[in-house]
Interface confidence: medium
């Protein structure tokens, strides 16, 4: 069952899935000047059995100018650097994900893919939030949102995260100066289509993915 809407937005924060539940779809989007090859897939699909999950289909982009030539799917290192949506740079190095049954890892990039990925999530999907660069979380621990089915309708739980800028902090004698927050990138979203960009995830998020302290609180 696909989730009806996007994970909630949080001011000055961005989200990322650590792993994708079977049934998740990822649109095959190409960057400006390129298009899907004519016989190419519209989307990649996370499928599998109890022991192994993987992405079905491959996304392939070709130059809009050339009709018949198809580009190789294998990404070149310099092309990975192009995948950004803001001036804020952060390494495209998600932490190693635990191999969860029934989940796919982040799909590798394909050549000339769009700067944003549009996912269609399924019920049970969990996404993790973190503050973008220059902002600090006021809550401790992983902030996540889960797509749940309630009374036949899907909804995302509200993540417990507040991101505040260091410049906003009132510095009185005896008050600590805040530490810098982890790096991240803002995202853009369109209704019913979830777009995410890669950003660096704190290692402890992966470690607590299955045993989150917030799953039962405030939902």
């Amino acid at each position: 069952e696909l989730c009806d809407d996007d994970p909630p937005e949080i001011p000055h924060a961005t989200f990322k899935a650590m792993a994708y539940k079977e049934g998740t779809m990822l649109n095959c989007e190409c960057k400006r000047g390129f298009r899907r090859i004519k016989s190419g897939s519209l989307y990649m699909l996370c499928t599998g059995n109890s022991s192994h999950s993987s992405w079905d289909n491959q996304c392939q982009c070709t130059s809009s100018a050339t009709r018949n030539t198809t580009k190789q799917v294998t990404p070149q290192p310099e092309e990975q650097k192009e995948r950004k949506t803001t001036e804020m740079q952060s390494p495209m190095q998600p932490v190693d994900q635990a191999s969860l049954p029934g989940h796919c890892r982040e799909p590798p990039p394909w050549e000339n893919e769009a700067t944003e990925r549009i996912y269609h999530f399924v019920v049970g999907q969990m996404v993790y939030y973190q503050c973008v660069q220059g902002y600090r979380a006021l809550h401790r621990g992983p902030a996540e949102s889960v797509c749940k089915m309630t009374h036949g309708k899907t909804r995302w739980t509200q993540p417990q995260l507040i991101c505040t800028g260091e410049m906003e902090t009132s510095q009185f004698p005896g008050e600590e100066k805040p530490q810098a927050s982890p790096e991240g990138r803002p995202e853009s979203e369109t209704s019913c289509l979830v777009t995410t960009t890669d950003f660096q995830i704190q290692t402890e998020m992966a470690a607590t993915m299955e045993t989150s302290i917030f799953t039962t609180e405030y939902q």
Epitope: H139, R140, G141, P178, Y218
Partner: antibody, heavy 116, light 107 residues
């Protein structure tokens, strides 16, 4: 079941001090930001101060900066608001709240009256 | 600070009526808007977050919409328990600010 219980309100003269407390239970207090919100009699709501889970970040509305101090004791699951140099315009019901994005866990409030 | 202006300040309506309350922000708040209901002597209760997401346990007759600077709370069919004061609140940037409130009374 989340519970927030404020105490420490009362009648105080202008220029004097008062300390409010908020005892929290039913959730992992040390993981969550907390805040104080106030409401003057017959008036609207306003955020007073917010504190991060570990107390390292504090935010105040301009009208209370330098007079009010928000703090917390995670070992006691308690939030505090130290109010100094009180003014008549500080008269209000003071609520403590958590789950700030969700914004739906509030105490019952404690009334502070500043009057000579 | 971002100013939040609600209209009307008060309104009278009857059970079964459809009611709309509007909230205007002094600058773009990116849909980071909550709606609260408050009854006399009680703490506020959040109805809607993120402009249009219904708080768990809140009846579906409440709905929210809007973007940019203009937002709306709609009650599709007023029930006796809905007569209260309603506040909008932005959480786009600190200090978070509330509207001045809209008092909904029985006609």
């Amino acid at each position: 079941q989340v519970q927030l219980v404020e105490s420490g309100g009362g009648v105080v003269q202008p220029g004097r001090s008062l300390r409010l407390s908020c005892a929290a239970s039913g959730f992992t207090f040390s993981n969550h930001a907390m805040a104080w919100v106030r409401q003057a009699p017959g008036k609207g709501l306003e955020w007073v101060a917010v504190i991060s889970y570990d107390g390292s970040n504090k935010y105040y509305r301009d009208s209370v900066k330098g007079r009010f101090t928000i703090s917390r004791d995670n070992s006691k699951n308690t939030l505090y608001l130290q109010m100094n140099s009180l003014r008549a315009e500080d008269t209000a019901v003071y609520y403590c709240t958590t789950g700030l994005n969700s914004g739906y866990d509030w105490g019952q409030g404690t009334l502070v009256t500043v009057s000579s | 600070d971002i100013q939040m202006t609600q209209s009307p300040s008060s309104l009278s309506a009857s059970v079964g009526d459809r009611v709309t309350i509007t909230c205007r922000a002094s600058q773009n708040i990116n849909s980071f808007l909550n709606w609260y209901q408050q009854k006399p002597g009680k703490a506020p209760r959040r109805l809607i977050y993120g402009t249009s997401s219904l708080q768990s346990g809140v009846p579906s007759r409440f709905s929210g919409s809007g973007s940019g600077t203009d937002y709306t709370l709609t009650i599709s069919s007023l029930q006796p328990e809905d007569f209260a004061t309603y506040y909008c609140q932005q959480y786009n940037s600190w200090p978070w600010t509330f509207g001045q409130g809209t008092k909904l009374e029985i006609k």
